[in-house]
Interface confidence: medium
């Protein structure tokens, strides 16, 4: 069966300063490929983490996905500031050259709250 | 207080079609996704359709895709469910659901409208 | 598709009774869980959500628990209007959402 990109919340708020995270869990990791996440959709959006070696300041991982049998792809966000806002997309790719998007999460739109 | 008012139900032949509309009052419609949910009699709450605020994403359950389109006007308050290609496996109570602002529950409900399709 | 089985199809009890109702996922949905009640000519009320939260003027009489695929609904002493029937609904996974078989509470 389709690997299934699940983004239980459809939304959360979160206060400028404080940190919040952005749930995603995978059906299987197979195809074998990266998980991205991303801020927006089409041409304009924009990576906001990716589950490699690349470094992302503010933004980590929750669980650690270099364990094989870990499906839990969720991130933190920290410090969060209000340019933060916006949705939020948990994207499962197949590997390849270059990698092929092959299912995405719903969304998860961050509210971003006046301290 | 959130009211939602299911109205349009009635008794039609299969093949034939019917408009189910919700009136909601309340809340601030156009911020809430929206679901049709129905039972049949003596049966089990059976989810149908869900439409966002915007009405920009639409799901259907795989029992009336192709069949039911699900809409909303905001100006006006209402949800609508315009039902084509009735079957007697569609004779169900239909009910109107509010979902949470965060989750696919549902936090509000109609009193539902009643469905049915007899030859 | 996630399938939600609910567990007794009938439970016969006096008021004052302990009401214990199980509801068993296909596969995980973490605590993305809700109950509703089901009385007759009115409309399905949310009891809890988050498995174990209840919703606002739900009466503390009233208490959910369990993750993953095993989830309990508890009605810690019946009181007439209890008697109704009760679903369990998952919304971790995306639409189709799903809701179990239900389970009728009955007065003996």
């Known amino acids: 069966t389709e690997v299934k990109v699940i983004q239980p919340e459809k939304s959360v708020s979160v206060a400028a300063g404080d940190s919040t995270v952005l749930n995603c869990t995978l059906t299987s990791l197979l195809p074998v490929g990266p998980i991205r996440w991303y801020r927006g959709v089409g041409q304009s959006r924009q990576l906001i983490y990716s589950f490699t070696t690349e470094h992302f300041p503010r933004v980590t991982n929750v669980s650690d996905a270099t364990k094989r049998s870990n499906l839990d792809f969720s991130i933190r966000i920290s410090n969060v500031t209000p340019e933060d806002a916006g949705t939020y997309y948990c994207v499962k790719f197949q590997r390849g050259s270059p990698d092929t998007e092959i299912q995405s999460g719903g969304g998860t739109e961050v509210y971003v709250l006046a301290k | 207080d959130v009211q939602l008012v299911e109205s349009g139900g009635g008794v039609v032949r299969p093949g034939e079609s019917l408009r189910l509309s919700c009136a909601a009052s309340g809340f601030t419609f156009s911020s809430y996704d929206m679901n049709w949910v129905r039972q049949a009699p003596g049966e089990g709450l059976e989810w149908v359709s869900l439409?966002?605020?915007?009405?920009?994403?639409?799901y259907y359950a795989d029992s009336v895709k192709g069949r039911f389109t699900i809409s909303r006007d905001n100006s006006k308050n209402t949800l609508y469910l315009q039902m084509n290609s009735l079957r007697a496996e569609d004779t169900a109570v239909y009910y109107c659901?509010?979902?949470?602002?965060?989750?696919?529950?549902?936090?509000?409900w109609g009193l539902g409208t009643l469905v049915t399709v007899s030859s | 598709e996630t399938v939600l089985t609910q567990s007794p199809g009938t439970l016969s009890l006096s008021p004052g009774e302990r009401a214990t109702l199980n509801c068993r996922a296909s596969q995980s949905v973490y605590s993305y869980l809700a109950w509703y009640q089901e009385r007759p000519g009115q409309a399905p009320r949310l009891l809890i959500y988050?498995?174990?939260t209840r919703a606002t003027g739900i009466p503390d009489r009233f208490s959910g628990s369990g993750s993953g695929t095993e989830f309990t609904l508890t009605i810690s002493s019946l009181e007439s209007d209890d008697f109704a029937v009760y679903y369990c609904?998952?919304?971790?996974?995306?639409?189709?959402?799903?809701f179990g078989g239900g389970t009728k509470v009955e007065i003996k």
């Open positions: 988050g498995a174990s």
């Open positions: 659901a509010k979902e949470n602002n965060r989750y696919r529950f549902f936090d509000d």
């Open positions: 439409i966002s605020g915007s009405g920009e994403i639409i």
């Open positions: 609904q998952q919304y971790y996974d995306r639409p189709p959402l799903t």
